[in-house]
């Protein structure tokens, strides 16, 4: 997270980290006791999922292995459209004050809405500095028309843009798959942006979760 600050302790109990061994790979969100939602481009053969602590490496955190993941069937490695994936935990997460399910959206929030993006990704770019504590930054949703002015034909209709004009506030490497939460509901998953991260007036691009709630619920039901 660029130009952010440590999240208020316990304010993101649905935030998870997907680890490859002990190394941060991506962010994600807990949908229920068995399922994590992340970005499709974060796919690996096996995952270790960190839950229940804002601090990576915290011994009190839950660490659960996951070996099954289901990319959206429409995901494209070329355009990165439909960049979302469900990861099935090998054992159930124990819900607590620090481990909660995220609220999936019942509607798409409009441009101008203030949202929070969070993650353990690098806080500097192109030189990397990985924090141990979960970082947060507030950004505003940007209309597709305004975002298309920046990204032109790279933008697809299930992508959502967010940022602050003339500001560095943005996500970065390691934050991918993590949550963009607006008015208490999950509206986006970190998908992509420009490099180096935090270039003013280059918005972050997110998978627009409100367009995929049916696929999320159907996929969890199908692979119960």
């Amino acid at each position: 997270i660029i130009d952010g600050a440590p999240c208020a302790r316990g304010s993101h109990p649905w935030q998870v980290a997907l680890l490859s061994g002990n190394q941060l790979h991506c962010g994600g969100v807990l949908v229920n006791e068995r399922w994590v939602l992340t970005a499709a481009h974060c796919k690996m053969n096996e995952y270790t999922v960190h839950l229940g602590s804002d601090t990576l490496g915290d011994r009190r955190a839950q660490r659960i292995k996951a070996s099954k993941s289901f990319r959206h069937p429409g995901y494209s490695t070329q355009t990165h459209v439909n960049d979302l994936m469900l990861v099935k935990l090998n054992s159930q997460a124990r819900l607590s004050s620090m481990v909660k399910k995220v609220r999936l959206p019942s509607r798409c929030e409009p441009p101008g809405t203030t949202c929070t993006v969070s993650g353990w990704g690098t806080t500097t770019s192109p030189d990397v500095t990985f924090p141990s504590d979960l970082m947060c930054v507030d950004v505003k949703l940007i209309s597709p028309q305004d975002c298309t002015k920046v990204y032109k034909d790279l933008l697809e209709n299930s992508m959502l843009c967010a940022g602050i004009p003339d500001s560095k506030k943005n996500a970065c490497n390691g934050d991918a798959g993590g949550p963009l939460v607006c008015r208490g509901t999950l509206q986006g998953l970190v998908s992509w942006g420009t490099f180096p991260c935090g270039q003013p007036n280059d918005p972050g691009v997110y998978t627009q979760v409100c367009k995929f709630t049916k696929w999320i619920n159907d996929t969890m039901k199908k692979h119960r």
Partner: antibody, heavy 127, light 108 residues
Framework: QLQLQESGPGLVKPSETLSLTCTVS??????????WGWIRQPPGKGLEWIGS???????YYNPSLKSRVTISVDTSKNQFSLKLSSVTAADTAVYYC???????????????????WGQGTTVTVSS | DIQMTQSPSSLSASVGDRVTITCRAS??????LNWYQQKPGKAPKLLIY???SLQSGVPSRFSGSGSGTDFTLTISSLQPEDFATYYC??????????FGGGTKVEIK
């Protein structure tokens, strides 16, 4: 300003292993969000990508060379290296090391252009 | 593997001419295409990344366009220092990263 410098023997015998090192100055391999790669150019021919290594240690190789190639990083010396085994005359080329600049973060991070190059070193395979 | 085909393989032009080089991918590569310039005995130099973004320090007479399978590098007004060989390169998330065969721009 970042600079890359290739070094290694200019002559290698057939069936032996070609070993080259790229020394990076003006920046750190271990804490920079870039790829570090090797490209070669046979005399009078075009460019061929050999492989790349990410600062975290992940490697990516050209499938046509994969069985013979190893790329590694020595962060303490700020160097990355190429080893190409069982060489033949067809491996005679100018070998370049280069930095791969990602086109974006997240899903666009795996795509990159080589924005800083070494000046190249000529390697001849001959007995 | 994705094949990159450049055309023409060589061309003769005069200072001040508008020069266009094309690159065709054997399958769609979205906008993941870079252009390089190489002078004899020198390392290649990145000119254009992501099909149309100008690398810093590169003169604005160079421009790139295209998406999918067909891409173009244009030099709006050829200068003496532009006589060189130009390569396109596609950068997929999975190897191999491949270069076109090159286009040599010579003095007419």
């Amino acid at each position: 300003q970042l600079q890359l410098q290739e070094s290694g023997p200019g002559l290698v015998k057939p069936s032996e292993t070609l070993s080259l090192t790229c020394t990076v100055s003006g920046g750190s391999i271990s804490s920079s969000d870039y790829y570090w790669g090797w490209i070669r150019q046979p005399p009078g021919k075009g460019l061929e990508w050999i492989g790349s290594i990410y600062y975290s240690g992940s490697t990516y190789y050209n499938p046509s060379l994969k069985s013979r190639v190893t790329i590694s990083v020595d962060t303490s010396k700020n160097q990355f290296s190429l080893k190409l085994s069982s060489v033949t005359a067809a491996d005679t080329a100018v070998y370049y090391c280069a930095r791969g600049r990602p086109l974006g973060y997240g899903a666009r991070h795996y795509y990159y252009g080589m924005d800083v190059w070494g000046q190249g070193t000529t390697v001849t395979v001959s007995s | 593997d994705i094949q990159m085909t450049q055309s023409p393989s060589s061309l003769s032009a005069s200072v001040g001419d508008r020069v266009t080089i094309t690159c065709r991918a054997s399958q769609s590569i979205s906008s993941y295409l870079n252009w390089y310039q190489q002078k004899p005995g020198k390392a290649p130099k990145l000119l254009i990344y992501s099909a149309s973004s100008l690398q810093s320090g590169v003169p604005s007479r160079f421009s790139g366009s295209g998406s999918g399978t067909d891409f173009t590098l244009t030099i709006s007004s050829l200068q003496p220092e532009d006589f060189a060989t130009y390569y396109c390169q596609q950068s997929p998330p999975f190897p191999p990263l491949t270069f076109g065969g090159g286009t040599k721009v010579e003095i007419k």
